[in-house]
């Protein structure tokens, strides 16, 4: 805290300009009026105030706005934003996407900090939903943003926003998140033709049910192995050898390299060895010829 001292004669700031950089901390505190600072915040960002001076400027704004800064001030914080705590940010009401962008720009190239996470949370809650423009902005700055949300939070994403999602935005999503996102993507891309649809939906397929995979197998999509390996095991297991062959097209040969890994391993265990042999890949572990397969879960349901 800077102690209160009278401003030396002739040093009272009439405007926020570069001369203030040479003011000592106590001079800045005494000679710069908080209201002047607030009305000329657009200049603050252009002036390379020292580390200590930024503390003084923050202190002045905190005194002027104990309930939280107005958006006109927030938009021009620049490096001052990095002096804010999550507690400070929780007092803000940020509604403009331009303000959000300006603050994200300050933290660009760095991982998401608690301050940024709080800012985004305040912004999204204020908007009521994660609209396309917001999602576009957030994933541009933080490709992993979408996958940092809980399934509950993802449920507020409207299908129209899915158009903003790039494949790399989903890299760290887990199956529970993809379960929420996939139906939205399916709805968003429903009017596209076969090949275009597959290109768009491919990243979301980790949330696809069996019936959708069966439908895709009829469309000559040639799914790559990386996508296949991310499919839900429970969705892959009911697929027949013929369906998997059609789904993967020329990529079917890749199954051999993945035969010990899920979901391929579990899928092999469910197939007749005879059927697997038709692929000519040397896949082993299928159900031997002559064995009867009982679906015990079905039997339990009936009894």
């Amino acid at each position: 805290e800077v102690e209160k001292t009278a401003c030396p004669s002739g040093k009272k700031a009439r405007e926020i300009d570069e001369s203030l950089i040479f003011y000592k901390k106590w001079e800045l505190e005494a000679c710069v009026d908080a209201a002047l600072l607030a009305t000329q915040m657009d200049r603050v960002n252009a002036i390379p105030f020292t580390y200590e001076q930024l503390d003084v400027l923050k202190h002045k704004l905190d005194e002027l706005y104990p309930q939280g800064y107005p958006e006109s001030v927030i938009q021009h914080l620049g490096y001052l934003f990095l002096k804010m705590s999550p507690e400070d940010i929780r007092k803000w009401n940020v509604t403009s996407l331009e303000t959000l962008k300006a603050l994200l720009e300050v933290n660009k190239g760095h991982e998401m900090s608690p301050q940024v996470a709080t800012l985004i949370d305040r912004f999204v809650k204020g908007r009521g939903q994660l609209d396309k423009d917001t999602l576009d902005t957030l994933t541009a700055f933080y490709p992993g943003y979408l996958c940092s949300l809980s399934p509950e939070e993802l449920s507020s994403v409207p299908p129209s926003s899915i158009w903003a999602v790039r494949p790399q935005d989903l890299d760290t999503c887990d199956p529970r998140q993809l379960d929420v996102l996939y139906p939205k993507a399916r709805l968003a891309f429903q009017n596209m033709n076969g090949s275009e649809y597959f290109v768009k939906i491919q990243s979301f397929l980790g949330g696809a049910p069996t019936e959708d995979l069966k439908a895709l197998s009829q469309q000559n999509v040639s799914m790559d192995l990386a996508t296949f390996m991310k499919l839900r095991t429970d969705a892959v297991l009911p697929l027949t050898v013929a369906e998997v062959q059609k789904l993967l097209g020329p990529h079917v040969e890749g199954l051999k390299a993945e035969e010990r890994h899920r979901p391929v391993r579990d899928w092999i265990l469910r197939q007749r060895q005879d059927d697997l042999d038709t692929l000519g890949l040397g896949l082993q572990g299928g159900i031997p010829n002559g064995y009867l397969v009982l679906d015990l879960s079905m039997q339990e349901a009936l009894s």
Partner: nanobody, 119 residues
Framework: QVQLVESGGGLVQAGGSLRLSCAAS????????MYWYRQAPGKERELVAF???????NVRDSVKGRFSVSRDSAKNIVYLQMNSLTPEDTAVYYC?????????????WGQGTQVTVSS
């Protein structure tokens, strides 16, 4: 992290010149502005000059026309050229910067270099 190392200080006669250097290493791409401070015996530390990443510079009024600041971006070195030195310029000179790191600002200082101006 940023490391700052000053050099070039020493004993000089009034009216003489010195050139101080501040070599930065580490996360130098994050550096925006570099500052030169000084602290004379029994006095509080004061800002002498700065240079921004864009190359704009400024020096405090008491050294205007005598001190100038420049940089060699390729070598990550900032210089403080001091001419027409007076005994009042005697102080330990420090270079300083701050960078954004993990969502907050981190302040870095060099160890300082002593400048003594004799009359």
């Amino acid at each position: 992290q940023v490391q700052l190392v000053e050099s070039g200080g020493g004993l000089v006669q009034a009216g003489g010149s010195l050139r101080l250097s501040c070599a930065a290493s580490g996360s130098t791409s994050s550096i925006n502005t570099m500052y030169w401070y000084r602290q004379a015996p029994g006095k509080e530390r004061e800002l002498v000059a700065f240079i921004s990443s864009g190359g704009s510079t400024n020096v405090r009024d008491s050294v205007k026309g005598r001190f100038s600041v420049s940089r060699d971006s390729a070598k990550n070195i900032v210089y403080l050229q001091m001419n027409s030195l007076t005994p009042e310029d005697t102080a330990v000179y420090y270079c300083n910067t701050y960078i954004p790191l993990r969502g907050t600002l981190h302040d870095y200082w060099g160890q300082g270099t002593q400048v003594t101006v004799s009359s």
